[in-house]
């Protein structure tokens, strides 16, 4: 049978071998291999000016493996497309291109955005933060003690960092002032230890500067985020007044 | 030398089946791939599909429901059934073989036989 | 399936004339193009495989190129035995589909 298929390949190709390299069911000098053992991937292979048939166990990077009745070859992925599963799948896009669901875009559709160290069209994350936590004693000079007015704290943790095109974070920290009964210093007192809960580090790109107080100090240039978050803050300075007036704490 | 030859009846019937026979000779046919194509009134070639060297077989999404191409390695033949055929199915119908995509695609063919379909 | 097209549909040419048929590929078939020649009342024959490869016999003034999506075949000085139909085919994927055909005649 195999002396059938040389003969007959013969005409066409002179040189025509059944003792092949690599692979090869049928192959010529001229042409290396014209056809491929079974379950091996036939590919063209370019020496130069020169294109030479190849078979392989799996097919090279910018190619996918078909697989027909008795013949397999390598096909070559969409032009945009580096890595692809078949035609209509890419898994790399070639520089330049965004990978979305297998598909390979100039730019990412509404919605979503470049990640451009992937290279892929991403969901836009917007910033997430925590429940405000408890609001600090009441402290004045880093003391709890031997004054009336002083300020007090809180601030609330980042859950989930934005994304290039997502909503910025708004305050992590809040101050604003407190009204205590002044409380004698015990000799050696200075009214920090145990009783101060440890103030969380600023978060990284995160300066205490930036940290509003209730005395409404505005940066001179306001993002309308910005804006807005102060307007919440108002709001909720004013939901506290109402909570605490049972409280000595007093907001001014 | 590799020899093609169609033979099979020139008038088929609205609705019935058209069998085609391909004798090979000079080549076995346990070897490489072995198609059937037909050419329309018009001049349009179409690729209808192959039975390879181990029998299996590959057909044309058009037609996959109403195809079969078989074999007899024994006579060195293979078949073309195909059913329920219309007047659209009045061709030129080749048989012709290829081995492999380094190599010359339908390198030969049969001198063709042409089935009208017609009552 | 890959859609070939090509052009011209006919075409009259002088003999000695260079003559040039392209076909288009509706994709990119990575040089799996084949030629076929076919005069009246006869099957078809492979002039050209993989591009740009003559098969055994045929006339040294028949040439092939392209890549990607688009395919020539060149008749670089016409004879009278080269009127006939000419016929494109990919077979980068199944179902291999040919072009619709260029009808050569001499003027």
């Known amino acids: 049978q195999n002396a059938s298929r040389g003969r007959r390949q013969r005409r066409m190709h002179p040189n025509v071998s059944q003792g092949c390299q690599g692979g090869c069911a049928t192959c010529s000098d001229y042409n290396g291999c014209l056809s491929c053992k079974p379950r091996l991937f036939f590919v063209l292979e370019r020496i130069g000016m020169k294109q030479i048939g190849v078979c392989l166990s799996s097919c090279p990077s910018g190619y996918y493996g078909t697989r027909y009745p008795d013949i397999n070859k390598c096909t070559k992925c969409k032009a945009d497309c580096d890595t692809c599963f078949n035609k209509n799948f890419c898994t790399k896009c070639k520089s330049g291109f965004y990978l979305h669901l297998g598909k390979c875009l100039d730019n990412c559709p509404e919605g979503l955005e470049a990640n451009n160290h992937t290279m892929e069209c991403v969901n836009i994350v917007h910033c997430e933060v925590s429940e405000w936590n408890p609001w600090s004693p009441c402290t004045k000079k880093g003391k709890t003690c031997g004054f009336k007015r002083g300020t007090e704290t809180r601030v609330r943790e980042i859950m989930q960092h934005p994304s290039a095109k997502g909503n910025l974070c708004p305050p992590t920290n809040e101050t604003r002032k407190c009204t205590v009964q002044r409380k004698k210093c015990q000799k050696g007192e200075r009214g920090k230890k145990g009783r101060e809960r440890k103030r969380k580090k600023p978060n990284k790109g995160e300066s205490k500067e930036a940290i509003p107080d209730s005395k409404g100090l505005e940066s001179s240039k306001e993002t309308p985020e910005q804006r807005e978050n102060k307007q919440q803050q108002k709001k909720r300075k004013v939901q506290d007044k109402q909570q605490k007036s049972v409280s000595v704490s007093t907001v001014h | 030398e590799v020899q093609l030859q169609e033979s099979g009846p020139s008038l088929v019937k609205p609705s019935q089946t058209l069998s085609l026979t391909c004798s090979v000779t000079g080549d076995s046919i346990t070897s490489g791939y072995w198609s059937w194509i037909r050419k329309f009134p018009g001049n349009k070639l179409e690729f209808m599909g192959y039975i390879s060297f181990s029998g299996k077989t590959y057909y044309i999404p058009s037609l996959k429901s109403r195809v079969s191409i078989t074999r007899d390695t024994s006579k060195n033949q293979y078949y073309l059934q195909l059913n329920s055929v219309t007047t659209e199915d009045t061709a030129t119908y080749y048989c012709a073989t290829y081995h492999g995509y380094g190599g010359p695609w339908f390198a030969y063919w049969g001198q063709g036989t042409l089935v009208t379909v017609s009552s | 399936d890959i859609k070939m097209t090509q052009s011209p549909s006919s075409m009259y040419a002088s003999l000695g004339e260079r003559v040039t048929i392209t076909c288009k590929a509706s994709?990119?078939?990575?040089?799996?193009l084949s030629w076929f020649q076919q005069k009246p009342g006869k099957s078809p024959k492979t002039l050209i495989y993989?591009?740009?490869r003559l098969i055994d016999g045929v006339p040294s003034r028949f040439s092939g190129s392209g890549s990607g999506q688009d395919y020539s075949l060149t008749i670089n000085s016409l004879e009278y035995e080269d009127m006939g139909i000419y016929y494109c085919?990919?077979?980068?994927?199944?179902?291999?589909?040919f072009g619709a055909g260029t009808r050569l005649e001499i003027k």
């Open positions: 993989l591009t740009n």
């Open positions: 085919l990919q077979y980068d994927e199944f179902p291999v589909t």
């Open positions: 994709q990119d078939i990575d040089s799996y």
